[in-house]
């Protein structure tokens, strides 16, 4: 129950108070007493309950016609059962009684009141009155957890601004209104009473920037909606008529958690008294409701796919035209970011990875947009983010960046457990340097920081420095699978192409040629690849540095050694001896369900099938999936990526809710 | 086989800042690394940065780390040295270098750290 | 004081061999393949004459060559001939902070 504030009683004059039901109020009984008096009795309005203690040991006694020592160890509370019809309409009596002289009463006139901020602390969806039953104050994870949730209101419904909603400080219509949080203050008072006591809705100064609540007008159009709390304005007084009343006001956050901002938002309403002009308002009663911003969360590739995006670019027909029969076959919706919009820039994945938030009325897909800020710069926050899509970017807008922080180089897991700590919504991939030098690359700090501050997918930094573009989407890719724990790990695997390819030169097709078909290109049998020695040297490298992962991902994401599958792929080192795929890099796939978008190989063709693509299908049809092979290799392999690096997938949110998890 | 070009050179005081341009013609860039060397007058040679082909990583001198930014735009087939800060020490001829076309063998060991192309250099004077 | 050592100067007559040392150390010459050879001709830019310790672009005679043992590297010229006084610079990769490491250069004079 939520504390009121201490009144002291006087016999020399009545005390007027007020409580508000839900309240708990501590009465001094004794510091006023009369000096000969050693114990007293209490009557009290059929409104009131009193409770007297005596500790310690504390015994509770509700008032009765008992009389009581008069000693500090005495506790008297009171609460109030029914708001007051008038002023003062609810008395208490206290009667002191001391040997020698006759009984002394002091009178207390109690107005009770009901004040209480409500917003959904029980994650229903609904605001219903807590009465303050619950301790709104706190904010708890878990299943049985409780706290209320703000949405970073981070789309733009307003098709003609080019801002975001949480940017301005209007309410633009019923839309913009349903991003936000609903809070009720409800008020039952005598009539008069707010002649004499005053209401503020108030946040603290160091959450200010990061919230803004908007007053609804009952029963008229959101577009009466005005700003009553933001960054401009901490506190706020607030008109409130005497009786019965509910005020509606809608919470907008303007700031995802990140290191300096841990989500938490209070907000909290005072019941000030201002009956004496003489002196300052003294505060009577606060209540607060404690919102935590709704992270941005990141899908795995074994959620469902709903939208698939690419760039046409110089002749790419051919690779869009298999990506959108892909996707149709997955059943998503497909969007072409045209040539004159891309600028020539076709790495889709790598400027923009799309996650979600959700708060229990609204779900809402967010595009966080890397810093890169290439040729697409502009197309996340021109083209992606609108009406019910959200926004958000992080990290130096111009320069300080490194190819770490494009966002081939993000990823998360599928659901996972990890030696009994449970990861319901994945853990977040990002690569890095083994050990920082002056040259070594890493992800911004700026992007790190926002990435562990969400706190529901917590990173694993992986070592990507070894390849030339330096992206974890260069060595490894989740697939869905019907069993174990319901996806595979597909790890680039240059010791997997070795065998195969020794396997079949012992079969006899050493003379068989790598990147055949393809103009232009050197062709390579098999038996010179595996002669190479320099090749071989540099695959063992590669071989090591992968395998490093592989043992930090087993340990991250408590996998077992079924739970990997081996891509045959070879790599090269190049400028500065960073690795690059010396084929198509196979595990650079666009995942859609069970429709898998590969880059075609090119490897040798034995028994009129390439060898490559059979192995991959062997390794990944018995799990329900359907391998397509894409011909990236001109306008995506040559330039150091592949499918996935070119193409861009928003997922159905989890149907897990991340307030329900324990981080 | 490419060619290089560099510009931008010329007479800046201690503290100021120039950028150098370093164009290709006859074959595209985006193929090759870049790398910056100078000489200074009547001296050695110095390797400055480097960029490579893919775009996606550079490295720097200690010299002149955190004074120095080298970055590339494909579509002006033309790399930058975006020079802060400078000291009399920078005073040098700069050349921009690149790789010669990739030998297409099934692997080209020990790329980024030799320069087959060099232009013709540009004189950078810092004095007051 | 450049971070790899050459001998400031050398010189032999026409038809000798000269063999330039370029002196490192185990963080650099000593551990990579990767030392090139660059001659200078006064006024004009420097040419690539050798890369990955022995191997020559094409268009370098076979006269110059180039070998490694332990932490030194050395280039030699046979069959010398006038054009090929010049300046030579040898290169290293290196594990120090800054990857790319010169010789202070060794002029060759053809007497």
């Known amino acids: 129950m939520a504390q009121g504030t201490l009144i002291r009683v006087t016999p020399e004059q009545p005390t007027h108070a007020v409580c508000v039901l839900g309240t708990l109020t501590q009465l001094d009984i004794c510091s006023s007493a009369p000096e000969d008096c050693t114990s007293f009795s209490i009557n009290a309005s059929p409104g009131v309950v009193v409770d007297i203690a005596h500790g310690p040991p504390a015994k509770k006694k509700s008032t009765g016609s008992s009389t009581w020592p008069l000693d500090p160890g005495v506790e008297v509370t009171l609460t109030m059962k029914v708001a007051s019809g008038s002023t003062g309409d609810q008395k208490v009596q206290i009667s002191y009684y001391g040997p020698k002289t006759p009984p002394v009463k002091a009178l207390l006139y109690l107005t009770g009141v009901e004040i209480s901020l409500c917003a959904d602390i029980t994650r229903t969806g609904k605001v219903k009155p807590t009465r303050a039953v619950k301790d709104q104050r706190t904010w708890t994870w878990g299943p049985c957890g409780q706290g209320a949730i703000l949405l970073v209101n981070c789309d733009r419904d307003n098709l003609e601004s080019s801002a975001m909603d949480c940017e301005d400080d209007e309410v633009l219509d019923s839309e913009d209104l349903q991003d936000m949080s609903l809070m009720t203050l409800s008020t039952k008072t005598p009539k008069d009473f707010f002649t004499n006591h005053t209401l503020v809705l108030h946040v603290a100064r160091s959450e200010m920037d990061k919230v803004r609540v908007f007053q609804a007008t009952r029963g008229k159009l959101s577009s009466k909606c005005s700003v009553v709390l933001g960054p401009k304005w901490p506190s706020h007084y607030l008109m409130v008529p005497g009786g019965k009343h509910n005020m509606d006001f809608y919470v907008e956050a303007l700031a995802f958690p990140d290191t300096d901002f841990p989500g938490l938002i209070t907000l909290t309403i005072s019941l000030l008294d201002t009956s004496n002009l003489e002196l300052p308002e003294a505060v009577v009663f606060q209540d607060s409701v404690v919102f935590r911003v709704a992270p941005w969360i990141m899908t795995p590739n074994t959620q469902p796919p709903q939208e698939v995006y690419a760039c046409s670019i110089f002749e790419n027909e051919d690779f869009l035209k298999s990506v959108t029969t892909l996707a149709m076959k997955a059943k998503c919706k497909l969007t072409i970011c045209p040539e004159e919009e891309n600028m020539d820039d076709q790495w889709m994945q790598d400027e923009m990875e799309i996650g979600y938030i959700q708060a229990p009325h609204k779900t809402l897909p967010v595009v966080f947009d890397s810093p890169r800020n290439r040729g697409l710069k502009e197309f996340p926050i021109k083209r992606v983010m609108g009406p019910d899509f959200g926004y958000v970017t992080r990290g130096p807008q111009t320069g300080g960046i490194s190819g770490l922080d494009s966002f081939g180089n993000l990823e998360v897991s599928p659901p996972v457990t990890v030696r009994g700590k449970e990861y319901p919504l994945g853990r977040i991939l990002f690569g890095d340097s083994c050990y920082p030098s002056n040259d070594s690359r890493q992800m911004h700090q700026a992007l790190q920081d926002f990435l562990s501050a969400q706190q529901v997918q917590a990173p694993v930094k992986l070592y990507s420095d070894w390849l030339s573009v330096g992206h974890v989407d260069e060595f490894l890719s989740f697939v869905p699978a019907p069993d174990r724990k319901g996806f595979r790990l597909l790890l680039a695997s240059p010791r997997s192409c070795y065998k195969l390819f020794q396997e079949q030169q012992n079969e006899g097709h050493g003379e068989a040629l790598l990147f055949e078909g393809i103009k232009k290109k050197k062709q390579q049998k098999i038996k010179n690849i595996l002669s190479n020695k320099t090749l071989r040297e540099h695959n063992s490298f590669v071989e090591r540095c992968i395998d490093w992962n592989r043992e930090l991902l087993k340990r991250e994401l408590g996998l077992a050694e079924s739970d990997i599958i081996d891509i045959p792929q070879l790599f090269k080192l190049k400028e500065f001896s960073k690795a690059e795929a010396f084929f198509p890099n196979m595990v650079n796939m666009l995942v859609l369900g069970k429709h898998l978008g590969i880059p075609k190989p090119f490897g040798p063709v034995i028994n009129g099938r390439c060898c490559l693509e059979e192995k991959v299908c062997s390794l990944l049809e018995p799990l329900g999936l359907q391998c397509t092979f894409i011909n990236d290799f001109f306008t995506y392999h040559i330039r150091h990526g592949e499918v996935h690096c070119g193409t861009n997938v928003r997922r159905k949110p989890f149907s897990f809710k991340w307030w329900n998890m324990v981080p | 086989q490419v060619q290089l070009v560099e510009s931008g050179g010329g007479l800046v005081k201690p503290g100021g800042s120039l950028r150098l341009s370093c164009a290709a013609s006859g074959s595209t860039l985006s193929d090759y690394f870049v790398s910056w060397i100078r000489q200074a007058p009547g001296k050695g040679l110095e390797w400055v940065s480097f960029v490579n082909s893919a775009n996606t990583f550079t490295y720097y001198a200690d010299s002149v780390r955190g004074r120095f930014t080298i970055s590339r735009d494909n579509a002006k087939n033309t790399v930058y040295l975006q020079m802060n800060s400078l000291r009399a020490e920078d005073t040098a001829v700069y050349y921009c270098?690149?790789?010669?076309?990739?030998?297409?063998?099934?692997?080209?060991?020990?790329?980024?750290?030799?320069?087959?192309?060099w232009g013709r250099g540009t004189l950078v004077t810092v004095s007051s | 004081q450049s971070a790899l050592t050459q001998p400031r100067s050398v010189s032999g007559s026409p038809g000798q061999s000269v063999t330039i040392s370029c002196t490192g150390t185990?963080?650099?010459?000593?551990?990579?393949?990767?030392v090139s050879w660059y001659q200078q001709h006064p006024g004009k830019a420097p040419k690539l004459i050798i890369y990955?310790?022995?191997e020559r672009p094409s268009g370098v005679p076979d006269r110059f060559s180039g070998s490694k043992s332990g932490n030194t590297a050395s280039l030699t010229i046979s069959g010398l001939q006038a054009e090929d006084e010049a300046d030579y610079y040898c290169?290293?990769?290196?594990?120090?902070?800054?990857?790319?490491?010169f010789g202070g250069g060794t002029k060759l004079t053809v007497l």
């Open positions: 270098t690149s790789d010669a076309p990739e030998v297409d063998d099934i692997v080209a060991p020990g790329r980024g750290y030799y320069m087959d192309v």
């Open positions: 990955n310790v022995y």
């Open positions: 290169s290293s990769h290196s594990r120090s902070s800054t990857p790319v490491l």
């Open positions: 185990r963080g650099d010459v000593g551990r990579y393949n990767h």
